[in-house]
């Protein structure tokens, strides 16, 4: 039994780091393998992660962490019974994939303005709480070409757009994702999408 693709890990910079790797053949990850991880710090204990299968030869493990600081470094040991298959390390702050925003809501009752709001996925004591920027994706269910991205580069988790920038009388969907420039993160997953019917009063044309 050998590791074909070494573990690569990403952290949500709060409580979970996810490591994925591939073995050289079909493997029952949860029965045959264990990933041991330990924070390199004074009182830290070694923890064991039981991997799950991720395709025939792929394995994935969710490492639980109480908290995280920028300087954190973890040792990782991948075991098959008594055999050490791979040894490595992981710095969460260098491989951050933020949590997805939640509670995306479209408020349509504000005088021909659409107000989209969502929740910051981090609590205020987390560094990323004040460092996320967002991308909002709006698209038409009727017209695949009617697809747009709005970049929200301010901290407030909201976006206002004129309803008239979208077509009236049709349904739209929106979703939002996050990233943080400070740690050069990847984008988060998209939030669940929300749907609304766009209608607004056309301005009265005078001839």
């Amino acid at each position: 039994m050998k590791v074909l693709q070494e573990p690569t890990c990403v952290s949500d910079y709060m409580s979970i780091s996810t490591c994925e790797w591939k073995m050289n053949g079909p493997t029952n990850c949860s029965t045959e393998l264990r990933l041991l991880y330990q924070l390199v710090f004074l009182l830290s204990e070694a923890h064991t992660c039981i991997p799950e299968n991720n395709g025939g030869a792929g394995c994935v493990c969710h490492l639980l962490m109480d908290d995280v600081v920028s300087a954190d470094n973890y040792t990782l040991d991948l075991w098959a019974g008594q055999q050490l298959l791979w040894k490595g390390s992981f710095k969460p702050s260098e491989h951050v994939k933020p949590r997805a925003p939640g509670n995306l809501t479209v408020h349509t009752n504000v005088s021909d303005t659409l107000l989209l709001t969502w929740s910051n996925p981090y609590p205020p004591d987390n560094y990323l709480y004040n460092h996320l920027t967002y991308a909002v994706n709006i698209w038409s269910e009727n017209d695949p070409a009617d697809f747009r991205i709005y970049n929200v580069t301010y901290l407030e988790p909201s976006l206002r757009i004129a309803a008239s920038t979208l077509k009236s009388g049709i349904s739209y969907r929106a979703r939002v994702r996050a990233w943080a420039q400070c740690y050069n993160t990847t984008w988060s997953e998209w939030s669940p999408s929300t749907k609304w019917h766009n209608s607004y009063r056309e301005p009265f044309e005078q001839h």
Epitope: S15, D66, Y127
Partner: antibody
Amino acid sequence: QVQLQQSGAELVKPGASVKLSCTASGFNIKDTYMHWVKQRPEQGLEWVGRIDPTNGYTIYASKFQGKATITADTSSNTAYMQLSSLTSEDTAVYHCVSRRPWFAYWGQGTTLTVSS
Amino acid sequence: DIVMTQTPLSLSVTPGQPASISCRSSQSIVHSNGNTYLEWYLQKPGQSPQLLIYKVTNRFSGVPDRFSGSGSGTDFTLKISRVEAEDVGVYYCFQGSHVPYTFGQGTKLEIK
């Protein structure tokens, strides 16, 4: 051996400012959050705020916002707390504590007396 | 802010007898990562506080097994199965789940 060594007792006049220090040995403050806790005479413990020494990110209890400023110098392995516009209400023992992710290591406390 | 309320505020116990301190939070102290950061600290006379229990039930290294923690949600308890003379001091519960972090008002334990 792990230790948090705090600066000595201070006697300062009302309206002045003071900067308390806390130097760690036996570990690197970059690996923890450094917190400050206030304890007034014959009273309980009050959380003031904390810093992530690597990026300088601070959070404070709302009542200490504007009163306390926590900083850290990773090169000297030291955390600081400056208290401004001092009044008699600020007379207390101030503890620095490292949290990872609980308060395992406490400094011996610095006694601050505000009196004219 | 979450208020941590301890009862009783003082207790006097005969050596060898059990003692129990209750701590109630004004709202849930489950962190958004799913953990409950409820801790117990003992401040012996003239000393800084010391950690006894973390994450509700876990004894810190070197803490005698006569100390135990329990509870969930908003109700938590510290039990000392057989009080010894060295256990005197003020016991504080603490929540580190939600900012601002908060301590209970303290329970003073003395020996009869």
